[in-house]
């Protein structure tokens, strides 16, 4: 990952705008406080990905950590991420606000902790005090994190001076607990099952020697009890798992499964729930719309993406004009189907350096033994326009004609323009548009042909000029959705020699 500017610490001006760029070999994303702020993501032609985060109208509240990380860490070093810390010195912001839970620090052992009082300006002097004391405590301060050390069970506040005023932080409360508080985690082998398949749930608690597990589940309410298995895991101390296994699930087993764990010594408890859905049969459902006409630009790469939900995992096939597609050895086509959550899939067809021949009718089919879905679209290859010919002729009729021929996809528009003052035009004088309605004595005739094999349109336009009394610069401009091209020719009066 490459971050620009590299940091690791930046001090920015309040009210300013600042741009952060991160690039990497896989999709990258900026994160701020575990969220993804609005940002511009792009993929360069050389295959590198980038994300640009523009911070506008900065305030002190923008002070903090910014992380750039891989958007999809599968197959990559999951822990690879770049951290940047930004300060925005802002005299209107004293200490940065804390979440309520950050003000209460619970300990179960003697260990170093951090009192997270942070300011917007790294130059400020910050001191730590007991809530009811004036003496500054000799604890090291890190402007990015706060005060770190071993603290007694007490209340603490931080102080700083901004300009000529003294500012106090919220109070932080440190509590030392003698036993582990219970923290339960629940997971399921699958949260979606078909009737007749098994439901297996696991409830895990760490750090307490003697606990009691109690499960509530839909079947229990109808008096059909299932005996959970308690597993004392051996990988670390006091790692206990309760396994609830329901064989041959029925539709009525859909619902909420709750694991409640209690520890009787201090009467601590925690519970977590998970939802299980039992379906009559498997399903495949498309998510979102994919237009029936898709576009790709000639010689550029294009990824066509279909998002769908399915259970059980489906087989995914792509077809072009009813022929099955596969990853090409030449690397012109890449197919991938990713499981982005338990039942959600993203299937992608990537056409590398698109060719005209790749236009056509595409279908993605996702299926398993219970269901199938297919999605079809026409792929149009857009070809930038080019003017192939611009020629002038003098028919016997006395008029002069200029013929312009060009090609492109989608169909190009043709614009004729002329300039009489060759010295000053087109820089100083705008060219005059020509056409049937123009004040110039001119007429236009345009023909369009679609070339099936090349899958592009050819436009031939003839401009008839009734009388030309002095040299005229005539310009033919072809334009379509993916570009434009211009050529010009000088038309001289009959009377003037070439």
């Amino acid at each position: 990952l490459v971050v620009t500017p590299p940091g690791p610490e930046l001090v920015l001006n309040v009210s300013s705008t600042f741009v952060l760029t991160c690039s990497g070999s896989a999709p990258v994303v900026w994160e701020r406080m575990s969220q993804e702020p609005p940002q511009e993501m792009a993929k360069a032609q050389d295959g590198t990905f980038s994300s640009v985060l523009t911070l506008t109208n900065l305030t002190g509240l923008d002070t903090g950590e910014y992380f750039c990380t891989h958007n999809d860490s599968r197959g990559l070093e999951t822990d690879e991420r770049k951290r940047l810390y930004i300060f925005v010195p802002d005299p209107t912001v004293g200490f940065l606000p804390n979440d309520a839970e950050e003000l209460f620090i619970f300990l179960t052992e003697i260990t170093e902790i951090t009192i997270p009082c942070r300011v917007t300006d790294p130059q400020l002097v910050v001191t730590l005090h007991e809530k009811k004391g004036d003496v500054a405590l000799p604890v090291p301060y890190d402007h990015q994190r706060g005060f770190s050390g071993i603290f007694e069970d007490r209340s603490y506040i931080c102080k700083t001076t901004i300009g000529d005023r003294e500012v106090d932080s919220d109070a932080y409360y440190v509590y030392r607990l003698q036993v582990s508080s219970i923290n339960v985690s629940v997971n399921a082998v699958q949260t979606v099952v078909r009737q007749g398949e098994n439901i297996t749930l696991m409830c895990i608690v760490i750090g307490n020697e003697v606990v009691n597990f109690e499960w509530t589940y839909p079947r229990k309410e109808s008096g059909r009890l299932v005996e959970p298995v308690t597993d004392f895991l051996l990988d670390m101390p006091y790692h206990i798992r309760s396994i609830l296994h329901i064989p041959s699930a029925e539709l009525e087993d859909s619902g909420t499964y709750t694991c409640n764990v209690t520890e009787s010594v201090n009467d601590h408890q925690d519970e977590k729930a998970i939802n299980i859905t039992v379906v009559e049969s498997g399903y495949v459902r498309l998510l979102g719309e994919v237009g029936t006409l898709q576009f790709a630009e000639l010689h550029r790469s294009r990824t066509l993406q279909v998002v769908f939900e399915a259970y059980p995992p489906p087989t995914v096939l792509w077809f072009k004009d009813n022929r099955t597609l596969g990853d090409s050895s030449a690397g012109e086509i890449a197919l991938s189907t990713r499981n982005v959550s338990e039942t959600r899939y993203v299937s992608e067809l990537t056409l590398v350096r698109v060719k005209v021949a790749e236009a056509g009718h595409y279908t993605m089919r996702a299926f398993h033994e219970d269901a199938e879905v297919q999605l079809s679209f026409q792929l149009q290859i857009n070809v930038p326009v080019r003017v192939l010919e611009l020629s002038e002729s003098h028919p016997d009729s006395g008029e002069q004609t200029v013929r312009c021929r060009g090609r492109g996809m989608p169909q190009p528009n043709i614009i004729w323009s002329a300039c009489r003052d060759l010295k000053r035009c087109p820089r100083e004088l705008p060219p005059t548009l020509l056409g049937n309605s123009s004040e110039e004595e001119s007429q236009l005739e345009t023909n369009v042909t679609y070339w099936e094999e090349e899958q592009e349109f050819e436009v031939v336009s003839t401009l008839r000029l009734q009388h030309v009394d002095r040299p005229l610069s005539v310009r033919c401009t072809l334009r379509n959705a993916v570009g434009q091209d211009t050529q010009e020719v000088i038309v001289v009066p009959h009377s003037l020699p070439f």
Epitope: T108, E109, I110, T111, V179, S180, I206, G207, N208, E209, V210, V229, T230, D231, F232, L233, L234, D235, M236, P237, Y238, H239, I240, R241, I243
Partner: antibody
């Protein structure tokens, strides 16, 4: 009272598969884990494998490819299979009870001597 | 894996003497949740299987005489026999029971002069 007893063939040939059984009494395999430990003629102890109260399995990483641990809770038995035997596998094999939560080995069987020789 | 190192490999003492043996682990065996050290000591008399003496570094297994004392924390542990008896002739092994994979020390052989 708590008891564990190992059984299995005393003499094996290289490349064969060793099958050992640990039969327990005085406690339930659904409440406690069971572990296998071996002791070489030179006296060193080496932990081999374990199965937890809920049936999760654990293996010594150096031996993992040759090992399989399983159990039959209704018969109070734990089984260890070790394939592709080598002469270096000659040792006393013990099964132990694993005390839940704290994971120490509070009871040991008398052991069974396994000699691997051609 | 956690490596356990025991010293000395053997020692000879007279009955009634105090003896100490050391066990060091390559990683701390202190579990944060309850500040306990997950180290056990086993005694193996000639021709017998190992027997649990001490667990959690200092807790004596029931039936073990109080002359066996376990101490230490983190990575450094000691087994002390305050007044050696003839029946204490045995090999003594330390083991980390913090968790999988379980590892043993190479043992200390105690001989009676």
């Amino acid at each position: 009272q708590v008891q564990l007893k190992e059984s299995g063939p005393g003499l094996m040939q290289p490349s064969q598969t060793l099958s050992l059984t640990c039969t327990v009494s005085g406690f339930s395999l659904t409440n406690y884990g069971v572990s296998w430990v071996r002791q070489f003629p030179g006296k060193g102890l080496e932990w081999i494998a374990a199965i937890s109260s809920g049936g999760s399995t654990y293996y010594n990483s150096a031996l993992k490819s040759r090992l399989s641990i399983s159990r039959d809770t209704s018969r109070s038995q734990v089984f260890l299979k070790m394939n592709s035997l080598l002469t270096e596998d000659t040792a006393f094999y013990f099964c132990t009870r694993v005390y839940y939560g704290s994971n120490y080995f509070d009871y040991w069987g008398p052991g069974v001597m396994v000699t691997v020789s051609s | 894996d956690i490596v356990m190192t025991q010293t000395p490999s053997s020692q000879a003492v007279s009955a009634g003497e105090k003896v100490t043996m050391s066990c060091k682990s390559s990683q701390s065996l202190l579990y944060g949740g309850d500040q306990k050290n997950f180290l056990a000591w086993y005694q193996q008399k000639p021709g017998q299987s190992p027997k649990l003496l001490i667990y959690l570094a200092s807790t004596r297994e029931s039936g073990v005489p109080d002359r066996f004392i376990g101490s230490g924390s983190g990575t450094d542990f000691t087994l002390t026999i305050s007044s050696v008896q003839a029946e204490d002739l045995a090999d003594y092994y330390c083991q980390q029971h913090y968790g999988y994979p379980f590892t043993f020390g190479s043992g200390t052989k105690l001989e009676i002069k």
